[in-house]
Amino acid sequence: LPAQVAFTPYAPEPGSTCRLREYYDQTAQMCCSKCSPGQHAKVFCTKTSDTVCDSCEDSTYTQLWNWVPECLSCGSRCSSDQVETQACTREQNRICTCRPGWYCALSKQEGCRLCAPLRKCRPGFGVARPGTETSDVVCKPCAPGTFSNTTSSTDICRPHQICNVVAIPGNASMDAVCTSTSPTRSMAPGAVHLPQPVSTRSQHTQPTPEPSTAPSTSFLLPMGPSPPAEGSTGD
């Protein structure tokens, strides 16, 4: 004979659990139906009647199968430094995440409670570790032979250009300035000679620094929202 299917509410066997999408009601001492996501228990079960569910009202939600008497309130509207990545619906809470250029300094179950602007490394310092959704930028001083002339949360230290003849040596916050070489050899007819560095860089490409015999002096600066680390600016 097939096993008899129990309809909610029913008394479970001693030691046995209720089935999926059911719960044991301590007051009724019966297995009763849960309410689906987007609903809540309007009337609780008794020994003779099952749970009565109702839809969540506006600005409230339930994400799980449940038996709560009232739906949960959606979180407050996202602040100006946040973007709403998930709207409040009857089945899910609003989720706020930090807008570009900001990171989450204090997270919550889902989304972010407090956003903070990404640290900007000042000239002479470059990004050692880029910011993420949940961590700030780490700045480091530019090592000998490299420089950064920007205040930026993304720019790394780039190698100085290599000159045939140096007009102004580079430092941590300024590129080397090359001078034209004089006089140059004669060239093939029609060729035009422009003074230029031996190697050129694109402003936007990740550099591959030349091997250097100078010892590296780079180190990571401490993280933390306040005060601004040396080599960084809160602007």
């Epitope: 209720c18 301590q26 007051t27 339930t62 994400q63 799980l64």
Partner: nanobody, 121 residues
Framework: QVQLVESGGGLVQPGGSLRLSCAVS????????IAWFRQAPGKEREGVSC????????WYADSVKGRFTISRDNAKNTVYLQMNSLKPEDTAVYYC??????????????WGQGTQVTVSS
């Protein structure tokens, strides 16, 4: 797959103490209230204690107030029940259960195999 595994039960003399642990897997404690209930042979399930997911607020049955303490460690996904001044009438199998979003009204969605607590001299 939701799993709750109780441990820490045993035989203890009246007035003694035990600490029960409930290791939770398959879901995060951030969302669920967790309850302890007990069942003695031939008796109905009795709610003992519950701790909510949102604010960590707690509920205790009158019979255990002042003697039992429930706590949770979300990082370890574990809930504890510290039982002091145990009495013979506390003898039962103790179960931990997911209590849904909150502790009231008390109910259990799923629970573990239980751990036996025996208080006897």
């Amino acid at each position: 797959q939701v799993q709750l595994v109780e441990s820490g039960g045993g035989l203890v003399q009246p007035g003694g103490s035990l600490r029960l642990s409930c290791a939770v897997s398959g879901f995060t404690l951030d969302y669920y209230a967790i309850a302890w209930f007990r069942q003695a042979p031939g008796k109905e399930r009795e709610g003992v204690s519950c701790i909510s997911s949102s604010d960590g607020s707690t509920w205790y049955a009158d019979s255990v107030k002042g003697r039992f303490t429930i706590s949770r460690d979300n990082a370890k996904n574990t809930v504890y029940l510290q039982m002091n001044s145990l009495k013979p009438e506390d003898t039962a199998v103790y179960y931990c259960a997911d209590a849904g979003y909150q502790c009231t009204p008390l109910g259990y969605g799923s629970w573990g195999q239980g751990t036996q607590v025996t208080v006897s001299s």
